[in-house]
C-alpha cells in the first residue's frame, strides 16, 4: 500500500531571463528512494540516482543545475519554458510517486524563488 505523499512548489511564476527552483518533497513513507526524475512534459531534464548521482540531459546542460537537495534549478528562463514539470520518485517497495509543478514564465514581473548562481 502506497502511503507517501508528495508536496511540490505548486503553480509558480518567474521572470523571463531569471531562474527558478523546482522542488518536491516525499513524506509519510518509509519506502527507500532509489531515483528521482525531473521531466518537462515528455522530456527528461535530469535524474538523481542513488548509485550514479546526477545526470543532466545534454540538451539542458547549460540551463539546468541540480539542487538544492533533490530539487532542480532552471536558469535563463524563456517563455517557452512555461508548462508542466514533474518530479518522479522511484521507491522500494512502494513504487512510483509523481508530483506536478506548473511554471509560468512572464515577460516582466518579479521573479519568485530566484536562485543565485556563479558559473566560472
Amino acid at each position: 500500500m502506497m502511503t507517501g505523499t508528495i508536496e511540490t512548489t505548486g503553480n509558480i511564476s518567474a521572470e523571463k531571463g531569471g531562474s527558478i527552483i523546482l522542488q518536491c518533497h516525499l513524506s509519510s513513507t518509509t519506502a527507500q528512494v532509489t531515483q528521482v526524475n525531473w521531466e518537462q512534459q515528455d522530456q527528461l531534464l535530469a535524474i538523481c540516482n542513488a548509485d550514479l548521482g546526477w545526470h543532466i540531459s545534454p540538451s539542458f546542460k547549460d540551463r539546468v543545475a541540480p539542487g538544492p537537495g533533490l530539487g532542480l534549478t532552471l536558469q535563463s528562463l524563456t517563455v517557452n519554458d512555461t508548462g508542466e514539470y514533474f518530479c518522479i520518485y522511484h521507491t522500494y517497495p512502494d513504487g512510483t510517486y509523481t508530483g506536478r509543478i506548473f511554471l509560468e514564465v512572464l515577460e516582466s514581473s518579479v521573479a519568485e524563488h530566484g536562485a543565485r548562481f556563479q558559473i566560472p
Epitope: E7, L26, V36, G53, P68
Partner: antibody, heavy 117, light 107 residues
Framework: QVQLQQPGSELVRPGASVKLSCKAS????????MHWVKQRHGQGLEWIGN????????NYDEKFKNKGTLTVDTSSNTAYMHLSSLTSDDSAVYYC??????????WGQGTTLTVSS | DIVLTQSPATLSVTPGDSVSLSCRAS??????LHWFQQKSLESPRLLIN???QSISGIPSRFRGSGSGTDFTLSINNLETEDFGMYFC?????????FGGGTKLEIK
C-alpha cells in the same frame, strides 16, 4: 568503495593563503555535489559552500564569499578550496563531503588547518 | 538564511535510556532535514536523511520524525557507542545550514 582523501594537517602563517585538497575515488566525480564544511575546535559545523564538478557551478555562504574559492580538477577527481588572507579565526578542521540522493553520505577525514606565526 | 536551533544543548543520560533530540527550523524546510552523529576526532556520520529515511548500516534504534519546522531524532535503548555530538542540517535552500548540536553524554 567511495573515499574522500584529505591531508591530515596544514600549517600556514597569518596573512598567507592555502589550498586544501579532497581527492575522490570510487564513484563518478562529476555527478555529485562536493561540499566544504568548517569546524572550529569543539564547535559546531559551518557550511562554506559547494561545487558541482560536472559544470563548475558553485554556491557559497555569504560569510565565506571573500574567504574561500572552490575549484575542481576533473582529470584527477580532486576538489580544492583556496583560503586567502588567513587569520587565527581560520584555524579549524575543514571537511569535504559528497552530496547525492542520500544527502551528505560520505565525508573526508578532515584537514586540520593551523594559522600561526 | 534558515536557522536551525537544537535542544537541549547537552543531555546527560544512562545507557539503556531512550532520548529525543529536537531541531527547530526558522521557517518551513518541508522534510529536507538530516541528522548526523559525530564522535570525538571523527568525521560526521549520516544517521537519518529527509527527516525520517533510514540509512543503510545505521542501527534501527535511531529514528527520525517531523516535517515543516519541528523535527525529532529518537534513540531507543542507548548504547555506550551512541554518546557524542548530534547535528541536524537542512538542504531545502542555499546556503545549507547546520544546527548548533546536542551533546549526548554519559550521566
Amino acid at each position: 568503495q567511495v573515499q574522500l582523501q584529505q591531508p591530515g594537517s596544514e600549517l600556514v602563517r597569518p596573512g598567507a593563503s592555502v589550498k586544501l585538497s579532497c581527492k575522490a575515488s570510487g564513484y563518478t566525480f562529476t555527478s555529485y555535489w562536493m561540499h566544504w564544511v568548517k569546524q572550529r575546535h569543539g564547535q559546531g559545523l559551518e557550511w562554506i559552500g559547494n561545487i558541482f564538478p560536472g559544470s563548475g557551478i558553485t554556491n557559497y555562504d555569504e560569510k565565506f564569499k571573500n574567504k574561500g574559492t572552490l575549484t575542481v580538477d576533473t582529470s584527477s577527481n580532486t576538489a580544492y578550496m583556496h583560503l586567502s588572507s588567513l587569520t587565527s579565526d581560520d584555524s579549524a578542521v575543514y571537511y569535504c563531503a559528497r552530496e547525492g540522493l542520500y544527502a551528505f553520505d560520505y565525508w573526508g577525514q578532515g584537514t586540520t588547518l593551523t594559522v600561526s606565526s | 538564511d534558515i536557522v536551525l536551533t537544537q535542544s537541549p544543548a547537552t543531555l546527560s543520560v544512562t545507557p539503556g535510556d531512550s532520548v529525543s533530540l529536537s531541531c527547530r527550523a526558522s521557517q518551513s524546510i518541508r522534510n529536507s532535514l538530516h541528522w548526523f552523529q559525530q564522535k570525538s576526532l571523527e568525521s560526521p556520520r549520516l544517521l537519518i536523511n529527509y527527516a525520517s529515511q533510514s540509512i543503510s548500516g545505521i542501527p534501527s534504534r535511531f529514528r527520525g520524525s517531523g516535517s515543516g519546522t519541528d523535527f525529532t531524532l529518537s534513540i531507543n535503548n542507548l548504547e555506550t557507542e551512541d554518546f557524542g555530538m548530534y547535528f541536524c542540517q537542512q538542504t531545502n535552500s542555499w546556503p545549507y545550514t547546520f544546527g548548533g548540536g546536542t551533546k549526548l553524554e554519559i550521566k
